[in-house]
Protein backbone atom coordinates (compact mmCIF):
# COMPACT_ATOMS: atom_id res chain seq x y z
CA UNK A 1 0.00 0.00 0.00
CA UNK A 2 1.57 3.85 -0.57
CA UNK A 3 1.57 5.79 1.88
CA UNK A 4 1.23 9.22 1.29
CA UNK A 5 3.10 12.02 3.57
CA UNK A 6 1.49 14.42 5.67
CA UNK A 7 0.94 18.11 4.79
CA UNK A 8 1.16 20.09 8.26
CA UNK A 9 -0.93 23.11 9.11
CA UNK A 10 -0.75 24.84 12.60
CA UNK A 11 -3.68 27.36 13.46
CA UNK A 12 -5.37 29.22 16.03
CA UNK A 13 -8.75 28.43 17.37
CA UNK A 14 -12.05 30.23 16.04
CA UNK A 15 -10.21 30.25 12.14
CA UNK A 16 -11.85 28.76 9.51
CA UNK A 17 -9.84 26.19 7.27
CA UNK A 18 -10.78 25.54 4.10
CA UNK A 19 -8.99 22.76 1.70
CA UNK A 20 -9.29 22.88 -2.14
CA UNK A 21 -8.53 19.33 -3.13
CA UNK A 22 -8.88 18.47 -6.96
CA UNK A 23 -9.47 15.08 -8.40
CA UNK A 24 -9.49 13.79 -11.68
CA UNK A 25 -12.08 14.65 -13.65
CA UNK A 26 -12.65 12.05 -16.50
CA UNK A 27 -12.20 9.27 -13.39
CA UNK A 28 -13.97 10.78 -10.64
CA UNK A 29 -16.82 13.21 -11.57
CA UNK A 30 -19.37 10.96 -11.00
CA UNK A 31 -18.37 9.53 -7.28
CA UNK A 32 -19.06 9.77 -4.14
CA UNK A 33 -16.41 12.70 -2.17
CA UNK A 34 -16.14 12.69 1.70
CA UNK A 35 -13.94 14.29 4.12
CA UNK A 36 -12.39 12.15 6.54
CA UNK A 37 -10.76 12.31 10.40
CA UNK A 38 -8.48 9.22 11.03
CA UNK A 39 -8.48 9.70 15.12
CA UNK A 40 -6.19 6.84 15.87
CA UNK A 41 -4.33 7.50 12.17
CA UNK A 42 -5.21 4.16 11.31
CA UNK A 43 -9.08 4.03 11.00
CA UNK A 44 -11.00 6.48 9.31
CA UNK A 45 -14.13 8.10 10.27
CA UNK A 46 -16.19 9.96 7.38
CA UNK A 47 -17.33 13.53 8.85
CA UNK A 48 -19.18 14.76 5.68
CA UNK A 49 -20.08 13.78 2.30
CA UNK A 50 -21.15 14.57 -1.36
CA UNK A 51 -24.85 14.21 -2.49
CA UNK A 52 -26.24 12.56 -5.41
CA UNK A 53 -26.60 13.57 -8.59
CA UNK A 54 -22.40 14.05 -8.03
CA UNK A 55 -22.35 15.23 -11.51
CA UNK A 56 -24.02 18.71 -10.43
CA UNK A 57 -22.13 21.55 -8.44
CA UNK A 58 -23.70 20.66 -5.01
CA UNK A 59 -22.69 22.52 -1.22
CA UNK A 60 -23.25 20.28 2.19
CA UNK A 61 -23.77 21.62 5.39
CA UNK A 62 -22.54 19.22 8.04
CA UNK A 63 -22.07 20.75 11.74
CA UNK A 64 -18.78 22.78 11.22
CA UNK A 65 -17.81 21.09 7.97
CA UNK A 66 -18.58 22.33 4.65
CA UNK A 67 -18.72 20.24 1.21
CA UNK A 68 -18.72 22.23 -1.59
CA UNK A 69 -18.32 19.83 -5.04
CA UNK A 70 -18.02 21.43 -8.04
CA UNK A 71 -17.10 18.27 -10.94
CA UNK A 72 -17.05 21.42 -13.73
CA UNK A 73 -13.94 22.53 -12.03
CA UNK A 74 -12.73 19.31 -10.95
CA UNK A 75 -12.66 20.50 -7.28
CA UNK A 76 -13.63 19.54 -4.03
CA UNK A 77 -13.70 21.82 -1.29
CA UNK A 78 -13.71 21.42 2.65
CA UNK A 79 -14.32 23.99 5.04
CA UNK A 80 -14.02 23.48 8.91
CA UNK A 81 -15.12 26.62 10.52
CA UNK A 82 -14.57 27.80 14.61
CA UNK A 83 -11.74 25.57 14.86
CA UNK A 84 -11.00 24.32 18.44
CA UNK A 85 -7.72 22.28 19.95
CA UNK A 86 -9.83 19.32 19.90
CA UNK A 87 -10.02 19.43 16.30
CA UNK A 88 -6.32 18.90 15.84
CA UNK A 89 -5.75 15.33 13.91
CA UNK A 90 -5.14 14.11 10.09
CA UNK A 91 -7.55 14.80 7.95
CA UNK A 92 -8.36 13.54 4.09
CA UNK A 93 -9.97 14.23 1.01
CA UNK A 94 -11.18 10.64 -0.31
CA UNK A 95 -13.84 9.15 -3.04
CA UNK A 96 -16.28 7.10 -1.22
CA UNK A 97 -17.45 3.91 -2.50
CA UNK A 98 -18.35 2.01 0.46
CA UNK A 99 -17.51 -1.29 1.47
CA UNK A 100 -15.04 -0.97 -0.71
CA UNK A 101 -11.29 1.42 0.27
CA UNK A 102 -11.65 5.07 -0.41
CA UNK A 103 -9.31 6.60 -3.08
CA UNK A 104 -7.54 9.30 -1.37
CA UNK A 105 -7.30 12.31 -3.46
CA UNK A 106 -3.95 13.97 -1.60
CA UNK A 107 -1.42 13.87 1.06
CA UNK A 108 -3.50 13.37 4.29
CA UNK A 109 -3.71 16.90 6.06
CA UNK A 110 -2.28 17.37 9.52
CA UNK A 111 -4.28 19.90 11.21
CA UNK A 112 -2.69 21.48 14.41
CA UNK A 113 -4.87 24.26 16.51
CA UNK A 114 -3.99 26.16 19.05
CA UNK A 115 -4.79 28.02 21.51
CA UNK A 116 -3.33 31.55 20.43
CA UNK A 117 -3.43 35.20 20.39
CA UNK A 118 -6.41 36.72 18.25
CA UNK A 119 -4.84 39.20 16.54
CA UNK A 120 -1.31 37.78 15.67
CA UNK A 121 -1.35 34.67 12.31
CA UNK A 122 1.45 33.47 11.16
CA UNK A 123 1.11 30.00 9.22
CA UNK A 124 3.62 27.66 9.51
CA UNK A 125 3.93 25.74 6.18
CA UNK A 126 6.09 22.07 6.21
CA UNK A 127 5.61 21.16 2.33
CA UNK A 128 6.81 17.88 2.62
CA UNK A 129 6.81 16.47 -1.41
CA UNK A 130 5.07 17.95 -4.00
CA UNK A 131 2.72 15.71 -6.66
CA UNK A 132 0.58 17.14 -9.31
CA UNK A 133 -2.34 17.35 -7.65
CA UNK A 134 -1.94 19.16 -4.57
CA UNK A 135 -4.49 20.83 -1.75
CA UNK A 136 -5.17 24.43 -1.87
CA UNK A 137 -5.30 25.90 1.90
CA UNK A 138 -6.45 29.19 2.59
CA UNK A 139 -6.83 29.51 6.67
CA UNK A 140 -8.86 32.51 7.57
CA UNK A 141 -9.43 34.23 11.34
CA UNK A 142 -12.96 35.14 12.02
CA UNK A 143 -14.19 37.57 14.87
CA UNK A 144 -16.42 36.53 17.10
CA UNK A 145 -19.31 38.26 15.41
CA UNK A 146 -18.86 36.63 12.41
CA UNK A 147 -21.41 33.93 11.26
CA UNK A 148 -21.23 33.20 7.40
CA UNK A 149 -17.98 31.46 6.37
CA UNK A 150 -18.55 32.78 2.59
CA UNK A 151 -17.61 36.40 2.45
CA UNK A 152 -14.16 38.03 1.75
CA UNK A 153 -11.51 37.66 4.11
CA UNK A 154 -10.89 39.87 7.02
CA UNK A 155 -7.44 40.43 7.99
CA UNK A 156 -4.78 39.32 9.41
CA UNK A 157 -5.59 36.45 6.31
CA UNK A 158 -2.86 34.47 4.81
CA UNK A 159 -4.20 32.47 1.76
CA UNK A 160 -1.23 28.88 1.60
CA UNK A 161 -0.82 27.58 -1.37
CA UNK A 162 1.17 24.88 -2.58
CA UNK A 163 0.21 24.08 -6.12
CA UNK A 164 3.43 22.07 -6.79
CA UNK A 165 5.76 24.34 -7.62
CA UNK A 166 6.18 26.10 -4.33
CA UNK A 167 4.68 27.69 -1.17
CA UNK A 168 2.77 31.26 -1.70
CA UNK A 169 1.96 33.28 1.16
CA UNK A 170 -0.35 36.12 0.88
CA UNK A 171 -0.77 38.42 4.07
CA UNK A 172 -2.61 41.43 4.95
CA UNK A 173 -3.56 43.71 2.68
CA UNK A 174 -2.93 41.46 -0.36
CA UNK A 175 -5.40 39.48 0.67
CA UNK A 176 -8.13 41.85 1.05
CA UNK A 177 -9.46 40.45 -2.12
CA UNK A 178 -9.31 36.83 -1.91
CA UNK A 179 -12.91 35.06 -1.55
CA UNK A 180 -13.71 31.60 0.02
CA UNK A 181 -16.45 31.22 -2.54
CA UNK A 182 -15.55 28.91 -5.06
CA UNK B 1 -20.33 -10.24 1.21
CA UNK B 2 -18.90 -9.42 4.52
CA UNK B 3 -18.60 -12.77 6.73
CA UNK B 4 -16.32 -13.84 9.84
CA UNK B 5 -15.54 -17.12 11.53
CA UNK B 6 -14.10 -18.23 14.38
CA UNK B 7 -12.75 -21.80 14.30
CA UNK B 8 -10.51 -23.35 17.72
CA UNK B 9 -10.91 -25.82 20.45
CA UNK B 10 -13.64 -26.09 22.35
CA UNK B 11 -12.08 -27.58 25.32
CA UNK B 12 -8.86 -26.57 26.91
CA UNK B 13 -6.54 -27.88 29.41
CA UNK B 14 -5.61 -25.44 32.34
CA UNK B 15 -2.25 -23.66 31.79
CA UNK B 16 -2.23 -24.82 28.12
CA UNK B 17 -2.35 -22.40 25.23
CA UNK B 18 -5.51 -21.38 22.89
CA UNK B 19 -5.14 -20.94 19.56
CA UNK B 20 -8.20 -19.72 17.58
CA UNK B 21 -8.34 -18.16 13.79
CA UNK B 22 -10.74 -15.69 12.61
CA UNK B 23 -11.58 -16.69 8.81
CA UNK B 24 -12.44 -13.62 6.65
CA UNK B 25 -14.40 -12.94 3.42
CA UNK B 26 -15.35 -10.15 1.63
CA UNK B 27 -12.98 -7.71 2.62
CA UNK B 28 -9.26 -7.51 3.05
CA UNK B 29 -7.84 -7.52 6.57
CA UNK B 30 -4.86 -5.40 4.92
CA UNK B 31 -7.33 -2.60 4.97
CA UNK B 32 -9.53 -2.88 7.91
CA UNK B 33 -8.74 -3.59 11.59
CA UNK B 34 -10.03 -6.87 13.24
CA UNK B 35 -10.98 -7.06 16.99
CA UNK B 36 -11.04 -10.10 19.43
CA UNK B 37 -13.64 -9.56 22.17
CA UNK B 38 -14.54 -12.14 24.78
CA UNK B 39 -17.52 -13.04 26.71
CA UNK B 40 -17.98 -15.12 29.77
CA UNK B 41 -20.69 -17.23 30.56
CA UNK B 42 -23.86 -14.36 31.55
CA UNK B 43 -21.38 -11.74 31.48
CA UNK B 44 -20.34 -8.50 28.93
CA UNK B 45 -17.76 -8.04 26.34
CA UNK B 46 -14.51 -7.32 26.97
CA UNK B 47 -12.09 -6.50 24.36
CA UNK B 48 -9.10 -8.39 23.80
CA UNK B 49 -6.98 -6.88 21.42
CA UNK B 50 -6.79 -5.83 17.79
CA UNK B 51 -4.83 -6.08 14.62
CA UNK B 52 -4.61 -3.18 12.50
CA UNK B 53 -4.62 -2.81 8.55
CA UNK B 54 -0.92 -2.01 8.67
CA UNK B 55 -0.57 -5.38 10.72
CA UNK B 56 0.60 -3.50 14.04
CA UNK B 57 -1.20 -5.05 17.22
CA UNK B 58 -3.18 -3.34 20.67
CA UNK B 59 -3.75 -5.05 23.59
CA UNK B 60 -5.92 -5.33 26.17
CA UNK B 61 -3.27 -4.44 29.38
CA UNK B 62 -4.99 -6.71 31.59
CA UNK B 63 -3.77 -9.73 28.82
CA UNK B 64 -0.84 -8.14 26.91
CA UNK B 65 1.56 -10.57 28.92
CA UNK B 66 -0.59 -13.79 27.91
CA UNK B 67 -1.76 -12.45 24.46
CA UNK B 68 -0.49 -12.37 20.93
CA UNK B 69 -2.33 -11.61 17.42
CA UNK B 70 -0.96 -12.47 13.96
CA UNK B 71 -2.06 -12.86 10.52
CA UNK B 72 -2.17 -14.21 7.31
CA UNK B 73 -2.60 -12.11 4.23
CA UNK B 74 -2.76 -14.65 1.56
CA UNK B 75 -5.32 -16.67 2.86
CA UNK B 76 -7.41 -13.30 4.92
CA UNK B 77 -7.14 -14.66 8.68
CA UNK B 78 -6.79 -13.10 11.51
CA UNK B 79 -5.40 -15.78 14.62
CA UNK B 80 -4.72 -15.72 18.36
CA UNK B 81 -3.23 -17.18 20.78
CA UNK B 82 -3.36 -17.17 24.75
CA UNK B 83 -1.63 -18.96 26.60
CA UNK B 84 -1.53 -19.77 30.47
CA UNK B 85 -5.08 -20.53 30.27
CA UNK B 86 -7.44 -20.57 33.86
CA UNK B 87 -10.81 -21.14 34.13
CA UNK B 88 -11.80 -17.45 34.53
CA UNK B 89 -10.58 -17.74 30.34
CA UNK B 90 -13.89 -19.94 30.02
CA UNK B 91 -15.87 -17.80 27.67
CA UNK B 92 -17.32 -17.57 23.91
CA UNK B 93 -14.78 -15.74 21.76
CA UNK B 94 -16.25 -13.62 19.04
CA UNK B 95 -13.98 -11.50 16.21
CA UNK B 96 -15.48 -8.65 14.25
CA UNK B 97 -14.81 -6.00 12.24
CA UNK B 98 -14.46 -2.18 12.86
CA UNK B 99 -15.73 -0.46 10.20
CA UNK B 100 -15.77 3.85 10.74
CA UNK B 101 -15.58 3.07 15.04
CA UNK B 102 -18.43 0.67 14.86
CA UNK B 103 -18.70 -3.19 15.10
CA UNK B 104 -20.31 -3.85 11.66
CA UNK B 105 -20.01 -7.49 11.38
CA UNK B 106 -18.99 -9.83 13.82
CA UNK B 107 -18.74 -13.35 13.88
CA UNK B 108 -20.98 -16.25 15.14
CA UNK B 109 -17.98 -16.88 17.81
CA UNK B 110 -16.61 -19.98 19.14
CA UNK B 111 -17.51 -21.22 22.99
CA UNK B 112 -13.99 -22.18 24.83
CA UNK B 113 -14.11 -23.99 27.89
CA UNK B 114 -10.76 -24.04 30.10
CA UNK B 115 -11.46 -27.48 31.67
CA UNK B 116 -9.18 -30.39 32.84
CA UNK C 1 -10.92 3.44 30.15
CA UNK C 2 -14.25 5.44 29.72
CA UNK C 3 -16.91 3.64 31.56
CA UNK C 4 -20.36 2.99 30.41
CA UNK C 5 -23.11 2.45 33.01
CA UNK C 6 -26.87 0.88 31.73
CA UNK C 7 -29.28 -0.01 33.71
CA UNK C 8 -29.60 -3.75 34.24
CA UNK C 9 -32.77 -4.71 33.35
CA UNK C 10 -36.10 -3.00 31.69
CA UNK C 11 -39.72 -4.91 31.71
CA UNK C 12 -41.77 -4.16 28.95
CA UNK C 13 -45.05 -4.46 27.48
CA UNK C 14 -45.74 -5.72 23.68
CA UNK C 15 -46.62 -3.28 21.87
CA UNK C 16 -45.11 -0.53 24.45
CA UNK C 17 -42.20 1.77 24.08
CA UNK C 18 -38.66 0.89 25.81
CA UNK C 19 -36.38 3.35 25.83
CA UNK C 20 -32.63 2.29 27.29
CA UNK C 21 -30.11 4.49 28.25
CA UNK C 22 -26.21 4.47 28.61
CA UNK C 23 -24.36 7.17 30.11
CA UNK C 24 -20.51 7.66 29.64
CA UNK C 25 -17.82 8.47 31.77
CA UNK C 26 -16.91 11.24 29.68
CA UNK C 27 -17.27 12.81 26.23
CA UNK C 28 -17.41 10.06 23.32
CA UNK C 29 -17.88 12.89 20.76
CA UNK C 30 -14.95 13.76 18.09
CA UNK C 31 -15.37 16.36 15.29
CA UNK C 32 -19.22 16.84 15.72
CA UNK C 33 -19.67 12.85 15.50
CA UNK C 34 -20.90 10.85 18.33
CA UNK C 35 -19.07 7.71 18.58
CA UNK C 36 -21.48 5.53 20.96
CA UNK C 37 -23.41 2.52 18.62
CA UNK C 38 -25.54 -0.03 20.23
CA UNK C 39 -26.25 -4.07 20.16
CA UNK C 40 -28.69 -6.38 19.96
CA UNK C 41 -27.44 -9.61 21.43
CA UNK C 42 -29.78 -12.59 21.76
CA UNK C 43 -28.68 -16.08 23.66
CA UNK C 44 -26.53 -17.92 22.23
CA UNK C 45 -25.65 -15.31 19.34
CA UNK C 46 -23.01 -13.06 18.09
CA UNK C 47 -23.92 -8.92 18.65
CA UNK C 48 -25.94 -7.51 16.01
CA UNK C 49 -25.32 -4.13 15.17
CA UNK C 50 -28.62 -1.77 15.53
CA UNK C 51 -27.21 1.81 15.84
CA UNK C 52 -24.07 3.32 14.54
CA UNK C 53 -22.74 7.43 15.66
CA UNK C 54 -25.84 7.71 18.50
CA UNK C 55 -28.26 7.78 15.64
CA UNK C 56 -27.67 6.05 12.67
CA UNK C 57 -30.01 2.79 11.69
CA UNK C 58 -27.43 -0.50 10.87
CA UNK C 59 -28.91 -1.60 7.48
CA UNK C 60 -31.60 -4.13 8.17
CA UNK C 61 -32.25 -2.69 11.16
CA UNK C 62 -36.35 -2.27 11.86
CA UNK C 63 -37.63 1.60 12.03
CA UNK C 64 -38.90 0.88 14.99
CA UNK C 65 -35.25 0.95 16.64
CA UNK C 66 -33.96 4.70 16.70
CA UNK C 67 -30.52 6.63 18.55
CA UNK C 68 -30.05 9.41 20.51
CA UNK C 69 -28.05 11.75 22.48
CA UNK C 70 -24.78 13.61 22.72
CA UNK C 71 -21.83 13.63 24.87
CA UNK C 72 -22.03 11.54 27.80
CA UNK C 73 -26.07 10.87 27.19
CA UNK C 74 -27.50 8.75 25.21
CA UNK C 75 -30.87 6.23 24.54
CA UNK C 76 -31.77 3.66 22.64
CA UNK C 77 -35.78 3.79 21.78
CA UNK C 78 -37.61 0.65 20.73
CA UNK C 79 -41.46 1.20 19.92
CA UNK C 80 -43.08 -0.46 19.92
CA UNK C 81 -41.41 -3.67 21.29
CA UNK C 82 -42.05 -6.94 20.16
CA UNK C 83 -41.59 -10.22 21.44
CA UNK C 84 -38.84 -11.02 19.17
CA UNK C 85 -36.97 -7.62 20.53
CA UNK C 86 -36.29 -10.13 23.88
CA UNK C 87 -32.78 -9.76 23.97
CA UNK C 88 -29.50 -8.03 26.23
CA UNK C 89 -28.45 -4.55 24.52
CA UNK C 90 -25.10 -2.96 24.83
CA UNK C 91 -24.26 0.75 24.09
CA UNK C 92 -20.10 0.59 23.28
CA UNK C 93 -18.03 3.79 22.59
CA UNK C 94 -15.09 4.10 19.95
CA UNK C 95 -14.10 7.83 21.25
CA UNK C 96 -11.39 6.95 23.31
CA UNK C 97 -9.16 3.80 23.34
CA UNK C 98 -9.98 1.13 24.44
CA UNK C 99 -13.23 0.94 22.69
CA UNK C 100 -16.06 -0.39 25.45
CA UNK C 101 -18.77 -1.59 26.11
CA UNK C 102 -21.75 -1.17 29.08
CA UNK C 103 -22.70 -3.78 31.02
CA UNK C 104 -26.13 -4.24 29.28
CA UNK C 105 -29.56 -3.95 29.28
CA UNK C 106 -32.19 -6.88 29.15
CA UNK C 107 -35.22 -6.77 27.75
CA UNK C 108 -37.86 -8.63 29.50
CA UNK C 109 -41.77 -8.83 28.43
CA UNK C 110 -44.12 -7.85 31.37
Known amino acids: AIVLEEERYDLVEGQTLTVKCPFNIMKYANSQKAWQRLPDGKEPLTLVVTQRPFTRPSEVHMGKFTLKHDPSEAMLQVQMTDLQVTDSGLYRCVIYHPPNDPVVLFHPVRLVVTKGSSDVFTPVIIPITRLTERPILITTKYSPSDTTTTRSLPKPTAVVSSPGLGVTIINGTDADSVSTSS | QVQLKESGPGLVQPSQTLSLTCTVS????????VYWFRQPPGKGLEWMGN???????DYNSSLKSRLTLSRDTSKNQVFLKINSLQSEDTATYFC??????????WGQGVVVTVSS | DIVLTQSPALAVSPGQRATLSCRAS??????????MNWYQQKPGQQPKLLIY???NLASGIPTRFSGSGSGTDFTLTIDPVQADDIAAYYC?????????FGGGTKVELK
Open chain 3, 26 to 35: QSVTLSNVNL
Open chain 2, 96 to 105: TRSWEYYFDH
Open chain 3, 92 to 100: QQSGESPRT
Open chain 3, 53 to 55: HAS
Open chain 2, 26 to 33: GFSITSSN
Open chain 2, 51 to 57: IWGDGST
